[in-house]
């Protein structure tokens, strides 16, 4: 996701407008506490990290407040006074949405209907993957806001739910990442059940670029 | 259809101030951010930065802080740039930007869709 | 700052002819690249977006490709209309762009 500079990836991570994690791996600065510097306005003085994330004992990353911040990241990774990285991004390309939140189903006859809580920004997609015991393996569909009707299902079969949220590739591009999963959800004849029989353990979102 | 409309010429002198207006339409105003872009006599594009017009928020470009000042008022639907202590190098095509695609509420990101026609300020004695 | 070079600056063709323009980026800039068209006394137009990705309206003779430092700007078979100023941008970070390249009737 960054560029090397002498030898530093940066992983950056936008999480629901709300906080920016960035994380370096400097193999030459493994045993280094590196610091890292920021800024929001390109003409501002740079703060250091308050809230960094450390990795066997060293620094690794930085957590930034960063609630709905309309702006570039202008940051610096730094050794002593010495800068190993510099760069600026804007925020948004990094988004990762939250989970979704109070998801529903509502049942008739041979259709379901999955709603959660919208988030507060648009451009996103809500998928919702479906399976029963004998699929062999998870069906999908999404729209744009969270509610989404699948419809043919078997009555009869049990079914695993689970709802996510990705932002548009379109609108904010190839370096967002997928919400986490929200619970799976078992459901047999319009009822809620602990599991279904044989379900295999679903894969886990792929968070990596 | 969205249209941004701006003023028209201005011919000024070194040390005075200009205030050049975007009159947005064709859409809701405090949805999307606005840019402001810089283009010298026969030379390239320059973006000078950008104002959140759902909250107010001024960003400037490296290079544009100071002199210049991106306002608003969202009643009538208009962005400004203020320029004061004009200098001859001043003298340039200043166009407002709309962006494209990401809304205010999650920020800018500088792709350019719409463009308003362009206002020439001629820094002269 | 992120610096962006065009190549050729300027560059004489034909209608029909298929043009290449070029643009370099002095760091990574994933796909985040937009190409304008400007015309004499007008503003620009967005044409292509995520490098590769063709702006609503814009004619299908306009292609991208690129990512990482390098894109490429094509126009398979040249219009009349296509004689203009076309700027590369990156939005990877504040917006920069190349400093153009003209393309003039031969």
């Known amino acids: 996701q960054g560029g090397a500079a002498e030898g530093v990836q940066i992983q950056i991570i936008y999480f629901n407008l709300e906080t920016v994690q960035v994380t370096w791996n400097a193999s030459k600065y493994s045993r280094t506490n590196l610091t890292f510097h920021y800024r929001f306005n390109g003409d501002e003085a740079y703060d250091q990290c308050t809230n960094y994330l450390l990795q066997e004992g060293h620094t690794s990353g930085c957590l930034l407040d960063a609630e709905q911040r309309d702006d570039i990241l202008y940051f610096s990774i730094r050794n002593g006074t010495h800068p190993v990285f510099t760069a600026s991004r804007w925020m948004v390309y990094y988004l990762k949405p939250s989970s979704p939140k109070h998801v529903r189903f509502s049942w008739h006859q041979d259709a379901v209907t999955v709603t959660c809580s919208d988030l507060s920004y648009g451009d996103l997609l809500y998928e919702v993957q479906y399976r029963s015991p004998f699929d062999t393996e998870w069906q999908s569909k999404q729209e744009n806001t969270c509610n989404v009707t699948i419809e043919g299902l078997d009555a009869e079969k049990c079914y695993s739910f689970w709802v996510r949220v990705k932002a548009m590739e379109d609108v904010y591009g190839p370096d967002t990442y997928p919400s986490d999963w929200s619970e799976v959800t078992c459901w047999q004849r319009g009822e809620i059940r602990d599991a279904c029989a044989e379900t295999p353990t679903p894969p886990k979102p792929k968070l990596s670029k | 259809q969205v249209q941004l409309v701006q003023s028209g010429s201005e011919l000024k002198k070194p040390g005075a101030s200009v205030k050049v207006s975007c009159k947005a339409s064709?859409?809701?105003?405090?949805?999307?951010?606005m840019s402001w872009v810089r283009q010298a006599p026969g030379q390239g594009l320059e973006w000078m930065g950008w104002?959140?017009?759902?909250?107010?928020?001024?960003r400037y470009a490296q290079g544009f802080t100071g002199r210049f000042v991106f306002s608003l008022d969202t009643s009538v639907s208009t962005a400004y740039l203020q320029i004061s202590s004009l200098k001859a190098e001043d003298t340039a095509v200043y166009y407002c930007?709309?962006?494209?695609?990401?809304?205010?509420?999650?920020?800018?990101?500088?792709?350019?869709?719409?463009w308003g026609q362009g206002t020439l300020v001629t820094v002269s004695s | 700052d992120i610096q962006m070079t065009q190549s050729p600056s300027s560059l004489s063709a034909s209608v029909g002819d298929r043009v290449t323009i070029t643009c370099r980026a002095s760091?990574?800039?994933?796909?985040?690249l937009a190409w304008y068209q400007q015309k004499p006394g007008k503003a620009p137009k967005l044409l292509i977006y995520?490098?590769?990705t063709l702006q609503s309206g814009v004619p299908s003779r306009f292609s991208g490709s690129g990512s990482g430092t390098d894109f490429t700007l094509t126009i398979s078979s040249l219009q009349p209309e296509d004689f203009a100023t076309y700027y590369c941008?990156?939005?990877?970070?504040?917006?920069?762009f190349g400093q153009g390249t003209k393309l003039e009737i031969k």
């Open positions: 104002v959140n017009t759902n909250t107010g928020n001024p």
């Open positions: 941008q990156q939005y990877s970070a504040y917006p920069t």
């Open positions: 064709g859409y809701t105003f405090t949805s999307y951010g």
């Open positions: 930007a709309r962006e494209g695609f990401i809304r205010t509420v999650v920020g800018a990101a500088g792709r350019f869709v719409y």
């Open positions: 995520w490098a590769s």
């Open positions: 760091q990574d800039i994933h796909t985040r």
